[in-house]
Interface confidence: low
């Protein structure tokens, strides 16, 4: 966030940088002396460093130019007084920090830092073997038959010559299974049983552990070599092969380190190789026993129309746009191809029906005309464009279509089984004549369209994938009696036990993704955080945590007040809202440091020029950013004036709110997303907006456009009321 400081700038120097840094560069060997680049042997965690809690742990530092140089030295252990298991490259100071430990070691913790990249030697974190397991450096210490291993440095009960000092680099540590000579059976050890001298350990092959569904587009495993054994090139490197698959350009493709991936609809995962003569090769990843797509990966199946790019289209149209018939997918005539049903098992390549197995812009097929290889089936209508009863007017309270599926593909459950729940959140008798079967309806006057109950206890109800009819301009917020509703509830400054709550920012949440701050959020209820859709790059909720009660993004100095909570569910906002309600695994404990923030009245209007603030730990424009929460002061701007400031290129609607900076060049930026626009009315602070990716960071004269919380207030209340929350 480009901002004024909220707190004094205490530069908390990085623990590891207190060491004396010698500005000596490692020469990079050229010509015949050029060594192989070993950075592909490391797992990278961007913007992360390791902090030693145990002061006895040693580290070594040196000035260098690139992370590749750090990696080569770590791999060779040259000049290091320990076995290097990981290193951090400090991009700002062009410096290596080599470690004899990694993030799994005791006495160490991970910490976020923009200028740091952590690289951990994969051999020390891998729990499977490649080939004979010569490079295995994991911590299994039990043999195949369950006998505990004898330590390598011990001669009891078995004398031997496999001394750690004789096998440098083979990591004969503790009593871990190893294969120092690369013998056929794989890693082994001397056993602690005097009757059994040695035995192999039952460590699986990585190719056995790894499996994929369908053609592996959603595969995010750790296979890092091809089917012929070639090591994969890192996706963030352009040598030896230049390519377009840059991790930062395709953040959703899982381009981590040098792992096999399928970003482009190939039959199975592949990678570029480190062999200059072999640009790319497929990887040997077996198909999972249950070869079906995860629910989360299934595109919404349609038969009559195209949703999105039509990857879920399962209809029977079998001609391209101009009527030329399609070639059968299992035929190689007139066009040879590898888009066969065998190669693309989950893509329903039946007969000669139009399909989109490779992520093209819409369904297509090979044609039966020898002169026209492929064509798009663009005559299939788009689901969003369908007319008649498949669209609704206003907020859809009169919708009488017969769609009975939610936007996530769940089948609606019967209205008559859910009347009790419905009565719980509406205060009038619903029109039973409209609530027939399990069709999508809007009995509670929901501003965001028809919805239905589901049979899934985790998702009690959801919206249906129906759009407003084209050209319908009926406002969804209708306030005839009160043309201007105040945003604040009528109550004045809140008082708890007779003492006004301190005007802190205890509702501010740091959403963590894989141990790093990724977004802001607002605690609106003990178990609920309001944030933005763009904050969730992974579908795995184990990747996320919510930190509450902190001022420092790293939690430094906040130990007494910090609460760390897991995330149990994400509830996505109405279509196009960019909002997410994040359910916490247990309720936050409200205290002096953690509090909730109020929501505005539904459909309210806040006067122009009202002074508001945005808060965040995001991009600040400072390389030595101190990690403290920042604030930028903005003022509310009317939608028309806002549009003018955006040179007429932006038309704001009722779901957006605009605020301009008091100090030019301040405003929200990356890392602030999900955080709140907070305004005060009648001495009450409310979250009136949510920061979502906009049009550049704090661009002078370009006010920020936020999601208008007042427009979604009823949805938020409805979720809080209807979704089950854990008890503390």
């Amino acid at each position: 966030m480009w901002v004024t400081k909220l707190l004094p700038a205490l530069l908390l120097q990085h623990v590891l940088l207190h060491l004396l840094l010698l500005p000596i560069a490692i020469p990079y060997a050229e010509g015949q002396r050029k060594r192989r680049n070993t950075i592909h042997e490391f797992k990278k965690s961007a913007k992360t460093t390791l902090i030693k809690i145990d002061p006895a742990l040693k580290i070594k530092t040196k000035k260098v130019n690139t992370a590749d140089q750090c990696a080569n030295r770590c791999t060779r252990n040259k000049g290091l007084p320990f076995t290097c298991k990981a290193f951090v490259f400090d991009k700002a100071r062009k410096q290596c920090l080599w470690f004899p430990f990694n993030s799994m070691s005791s006495g160490v913790k991970k910490e976020f830092g923009h200028e740091f990249d952590l690289y951990e030697n994969k051999d020390y974190i891998r729990n499977c073997i490649i080939g004979k397991g010569r490079s295995y450096k994991g911590t299994v210490s039990i043999t195949k038959s369950g006998i505990k291993c004898q330590p390598w440095s011990s001669m009891i009960p078995h004398e031997h010559s496999f001394l750690p000092s004789s096998y440098r680099g083979k990591d004969l540590q503790e009593n871990y299974c190893r294969n120092p000579r690369g013998e056929e059976g794989g890693p082994w050890c001397f056993t602690s049983n005097p009757e059994v001298r040695y035995e192999v350990c039952d460590i699986p092959q990585c190719s056995e552990v790894e499996c994929m569904t369908c053609n592996g587009e959603s595969y995010r495993g750790l296979m890092d070599h091809t089917e012929s054994g070639k090591i994969c090139q890192r996706w963030d490197h352009q040598t030896p092969h230049r390519h377009k698959f840059l991790p930062e350009r395709y953040p959703d493709k899982g381009f981590d380190d040098n792992y096999c991936r399928n970003p482009d609809g190939q039959p199975r995962p592949w990678c570029y190789t480190l062999d200059p003569h072999t640009r790319w090769e497929y990887c040997a990843i077996k198909t999972c026993a249950d070869n079906t797509m995860n629910d989360t990966d299934v595109p919404l199946e349609t038969t009559e129309c195209i949703q999105g790019q039509g990857e879920g289209y399962r209809g029977t149209v079998n001609t391209i746009w101009n009527g030329i018939p399609c070639q059968r997918w299992d035929s190689q005539y007139p066009h040879e191809h590898d888009m066969t049903p065998e190669n693309f098992k989950c893509k329903d390549l039946r007969e000669n029906y139009c399909r989109n197995p490779d992520g093209s812009e819409s369904p297509w097929c090979f044609t039966t005309d020898p002169n026209i290889r492929v064509g798009y089936c663009s005559q299939i209508p788009n689901c969003d464009m369908s007319h008649g009863q498949d669209c609704y007017r206003g907020n859809g309270k009169n919708y009488m279509g017969n769609l009975s599926q939610t936007r996530s593909g769940l089948t609606c459950s019967m209205w008559d089984k859910n009347m009790e729940d419905l009565h719980r959140h509406i205060f009038w008798e619903p029109d039973a004549s409209k609530l027939n079967e399990n069709y999508c309806r809007n009995p509670d006057d929901d501003a965001h369209g028809p919805w239905c109950y589901t049979g899934n206890p985790l998702i009690p109800w959801d919206y249906c994938p129906i759009s407003r009819c084209e050209g319908d301009t009926t406002p969804t917020i209708v306030n005839l009696d009160h043309p201007v509703i105040s945003c604040a509830k009528t109550k004045q400054l809140r008082v708890v036990n007779g003492i006004p709550t301190r005007t802190n920012i205890g509702w501010m949440v740091s959403l963590r993704y894989r141990n790093k701050h990724i977004c802001g959020g607002s605690l609106i209820k003990e178990s609920w955080v309001l944030t933005a859709r763009q904050c969730f790059p992974s579908r795995d909720l184990k990747d996320y945590e919510a930190w509450l009660g902190i001022h420092d993004v790293h939690g430094r100095g906040d130990e007494k007040c910090k609460q760390v909570l897991n995330v149990s569910q994400l509830v996505y906002g109405p279509e196009g809202s960019d909002l997410v309600l994040m359910k916490l695994a247990r309720p936050a404990v409200l205290d002096d440091f953690v509090s909730t923030i109020d929501l505005p009245n539904y459909g309210c209007t806040i006067p122009e020029k009202t002074s508001c603030s945005v808060y965040g730990w995001g991009y600040t424009g400072l390389i030595n950013y101190d990690g403290l929460l920042r604030v930028a002061h903005l003022y509310i701007m009317g939608n028309e004036k806002c549009s003018q400031h955006h040179r007429g290129k932006v038309t704001l609607n009722e779901s957006e709110i605009c605020a301009g900076a008091e100090k030019i060049g301040s405003g929200p930026c990356e890392g602030d997303y999900g955080g709140p626009l907070v305004c005060e009315q009648h001495k009450m602070r409310m979250v009136l907006g949510v920061i979502v990716p906009g049009r550049g960071c704090a661009i002078p004269n370009r006010p920020g456009i936020f999601v208008r919380v007042a427009y979604y207030a009823k949805w938020i209340h409805k979720i809080i009321l209807t979704y089950k929350v854990p008890q503390s």
């Epitope: 480009w2 700038a9 530069l11 991009k91 700002a92 100071r93 923009h114 200028e115 991009y619 600040t620 424009g621 400072l622 390389i623 030595n624 950013y625 060049g665 930026c669 550049g696 960071c697 704090a698 661009i699 002078p700």
Partner: antibody, heavy 122, light 107 residues
Framework: EVQLVESGGGLVQSGGSLKLSCAAS????????MSWVRQTPEKRLEWVAY????????YYPDSVKGRFTISRDNAKNTLYLQMSSLKSEDTAMYYC???????????????WGQGTSVTVSS | DIQMTQSPASLSVSVGETVTITCRAS??????LAWYQQKQGKSPQLLVY???HLPDGVPSRFSGSGSGTQFSLKINSLQSEDFGSYYC?????????FGGGTRLEIK
């Protein structure tokens, strides 16, 4: 070899406009924050504007805010400075500058162009 | 805004001598300071970054020291090619500001 070549300077009336360009070569332009720095006839150096590597963030000191606009075309490896409502105190040698690469761009200015002279006559 | 005060404004010295130029920041800028050298008719060149680090190609007779608010640039055994102007600059957030400069002349 890193090269920054400015152009577009000249004599302009007070209140007039001018657009400076800077052609960059010898490095991956799109990876670096870029700045314009000017040197007054009294030899004082003043930072005028910067732009982030992708062009999403720009920043100016109060003395030029609202009058100068920095922009870049990464496809053409070119940096621009559009100057309007020029004043006599804007008379200076204008340098195109590369900032050392870093996540935030708040780094020392490691390469400077040869400069282009702007004279504003009243 | 952070003010950078450089002293002395000018200095007249002989070849072979050692000189020290100082720069004071109006608030703590940690080690976010650079020194530049400008020869007559040329553009400035980076001499020191991060207060103490020399870029490749800068002779070792130049050295930077200091952190926080007090910084200095030392030139040992002055050579004829070292004459010109020297500027300090902070990059602890915007606006970046430069010192007023120190003009080094041959005695």
């Amino acid at each position: 070899e890193v090269q920054l070549v400015e152009s577009g300077g000249g004599l302009v009336q007070s209140g007039g406009s001018l657009k400076l360009s800077c052609a960059a070569s010898g490095f991956t332009f799109s990876n670096y924050f870029m700045s314009w720095v000017r040197q007054t006839p009294e030899k004082r150096l003043e930072w005028v504007a910067y732009i982030s590597s992708g062009g999403g963030s720009t920043y100016y000191p109060d003395s030029v805010k609202g009058r100068f606009t920095i922009s870049r075309d990464n496809a053409k490896n070119t940096l621009y400075l559009q100057m309007s409502s020029l004043k006599s105190e804007d008379t200076a040698m204008y340098y195109c500058v590369r900032q050392g690469d870093g996540y935030y761009g708040d780094y020392a200015m490691d390469y400077w162009g040869q400069g282009t002279s702007v004279t504003v006559s009243s | 805004d952070i003010q950078m005060t450089q002293s002395p404004a000018s200095l007249s010295v002989s070849v072979g001598e050692t000189v020290t130029i100082t720069c004071r920041a109006s608030e703590n800028i940690y080690s976010n300071l650079a020194w530049y050298q400008q020869k007559q008719g040329k553009s400035p060149q980076l001499l020191v970054y991060d207060a103490t680090h020399l870029p490749d190609g800068v002779p070792s007779r130049f050295s930077g020291s200091g952190s926080g608010t007090q910084f200095s640039l030392k030139i040992n055994s002055l050579q004829s090619e070292d004459f010109g102007s020297y500027y300090c600059q902070h990059f602890w957030g915007t606006p970046y500001t430069f010192g007023g400069g120190t003009r080094l002349e041959i005695k």
